[in-house]
Amino acid sequence: AILGRSETQECLFFNANWERDRTNQTGVEPCYGDKDKRRHCFATWKNISGSIEIVKQGCWLDDINCYDRTDCIEKKDSPEVYFCCCEGNMCNEKFSYFPEMEVTQPTSNPVTPKPP
């Protein structure tokens, strides 16, 4: 292990389309990849009239945008589908939305998903 880096070996798995894709709906996913690649967890979700609908959660492979992020946070302003990634086992259990925009009072929307 490299000092200061959280190695990701497993992530929370969720697939809203589990029936069509013929997968489990939820569980724990082991993260595989080449030895020289970093591994991350991710979450994607939608906000439908204030209700959080998780699309997918799982492992995500070597993405510089995820490096050294211990928390799963979406910073894009009002995307159609939210995405965040992080490093560390099961770091995608919770995810948040902190839009990067110039406002006087930025809002925090932490989410603890409860898959159906």
Partner: antibody, heavy 120, light 107 residues
Framework: EVQLLESGGGLVQPGGSLRLSCAAS????????MNWVRQAPGKGLEWVSG????????SYADSVKGRFTISRDNSKNTLYLQMNSLRAEDTAVYYC?????????????WGQGTLVTVSS | DIQMTQSPSSLSASVGDRVTITCRAS??????LNWYQQKPGKAPKLVIY???SLASGVPSRFSGSGSGTDFTLTISSLQPEDFATYYC?????????FGGGTKVEIK
Amino acid sequence: EVQLLESGGGLVQPGGSLRLSCAASGFTFSSYSMNWVRQAPGKGLEWVSGINYNGGYKSYADSVKGRFTISRDNSKNTLYLQMNSLRAEDTAVYYCARSATWHDTHLDYWGQGTLVTVSS
Amino acid sequence: DIQMTQSPSSLSASVGDRVTITCRASQSIVRYLNWYQQKPGKAPKLVIYAATSLASGVPSRFSGSGSGTDFTLTISSLQPEDFATYYCQQSYELPLTFGGGTKVEIK
């Protein structure tokens, strides 16, 4: 070095069957999802089927559903595609390709391809 | 199924040119977008994955950008070995789908 080597292609009559194989080496085959992608002559790429690392999840394009079956033998480091009820439109080069996870499906290594020709 | 539309379908360029290829998805695919390079008679080769990540062994003149529905592959200074066909591919949902390809030819 990662290597994927397809075999089993050839000329077959409409309605016939073929089984393609993809022999993998240079990586831990049992840790990776695998896919079949085809390319008709002079055309673009079409995903055919995918299977996760332990064979528990399988998925198919609508165009081959019910006719093709993907499988793997992790003890032999080999991926298979059983193709039945072949049609002229199945004529293509078939590639096997590796992906790290079932859902984050970027295909980081590809075989050289094997040509399947369906013709009477 | 998610439809992927690439433009242009072909382009002519000279060595040293900056080349941009675009790919549009029929719905948001977040960052589940990959780019491949294919030369005649050869298998495709991964160039960019997750919209912006450079694949192993790919020169830094290649870059990817975009999220949601609109994505771009840029070659900052075209080299002789870059003349090929480029495909985008979404991995947001199954079935995986590819764009129709962009052929980069020598002017």
